[in-house]
């Protein structure tokens, strides 16, 4: 999906006022320096991809995202916000949630969302130099 | 100004169904999407479902299943059908725009619809 034709401000209001509160709720009890940011963005739709791609597809060591409240609330804002976000999205994210049974909360999510929080304080901050 | 007006509430016994109606004055589909939302006593208020404009949906992973949002944007209303009641599901329902709650709010819940579930 293009996210190019996205409402930025939008999402980023809904970034602000309660996604970014529901990655720390998930991140509670673990050291900001913790982890390394390993990825990057360089605009804010290619963000938003990263973002999507980080919270709706399994990876090795963290099958378990799709189901919290802050990968709930990104997926309504894309699909509030991005228009025509396709419907294909859609179910790949609901086929990701099928897919797991219960909340196991690894090491490895930890670094993901961590990740994630690294995506989306980039995609607030789009005229930003890469560094 | 955004009008949303919920029914549909009333005792039910375990296993019953029940449908709740959300009916949207000041607001559209096209634009936003609508959310049902709970709040159980002594609890905080919680995700339901929501739907949009394309009949996208997300439901709640502790009514999934058992719980199916629907809309008829011709008379700008949301539904929300609810099987296989449990007495976990008591609470006072309410809809809002997605939009709304994204963003923090919505400042002020309109007056819900109350659910009881018990035999």
């Known amino acids: 999906y293009d996210f190019t034709n996205c409402d930025f401000e939008k999402i980023k209001a809904a970034y602000l006022s309660t996604i970014s509160k529901d990655l720390i709720t998930y991140m509670s009890g673990t050291k900001s320096t913790e982890f390394n940011n390993t990825v990057s963005c360089s605009n804010r739709p290619h963000c938003l991809t990263e973002i999507q791609s980080l919270t709706f597809n399994p990876t090795a060591g963290c099958a378990s995202l799709a189901k919290e409240m802050f990968a709930m609330k990104t997926k309504a804002a894309l699909a509030i916000w991005c228009p025509g976000y396709s419907e294909t999205q859609i179910n790949a994210t609901q086929a990701m949630k099928k897919r797991r049974k219960r909340k196991v909360t690894t090491n490895k999510c930890l670094e993901q969302v961590s990740q994630l929080q690294g995506l989306w304080r980039r995609f607030n901050r789009p005229l930003l130099k890469q560094q | 100004e955004v009008q949303l007006v919920e029914s549909g509430g009333g005792l039910v016994q375990p296993g019953g169904s029940l449908r709740l109606s959300c009916a949207a004055s000041?607001?559209?589909?096209?634009?936003?999407?609508m959310g049902w939302f709970r709040q159980a006593p002594g609890k905080e208020r919680e995700f339901v479902a929501w739907i949009n404009n394309r009949g996208t949906t997300d439901y709640a992973d502790s009514v999934k299943g058992r719980f199916t949002i629907s809309a008829d944007n011709s008379k700008n209303t949301a539904y929300l059908q609810m099987n296989s009641l449990k007495p976990e599901d008591t609470a006072v329902y309410y809809c809002?725009?997605?939009?709304?709650?994204?963003?923090?709010?919505?400042?002020?819940w309109g007056q819900g619809t109350l659910v009881t579930v018990s035999s």
């Open positions: 000041g607001v559209t589909l096209d634009t936003d999407a």
């Open positions: 809002a725009r997605v939009s709304q709650w994204l963003l923090g709010g919505p400042a002020n």
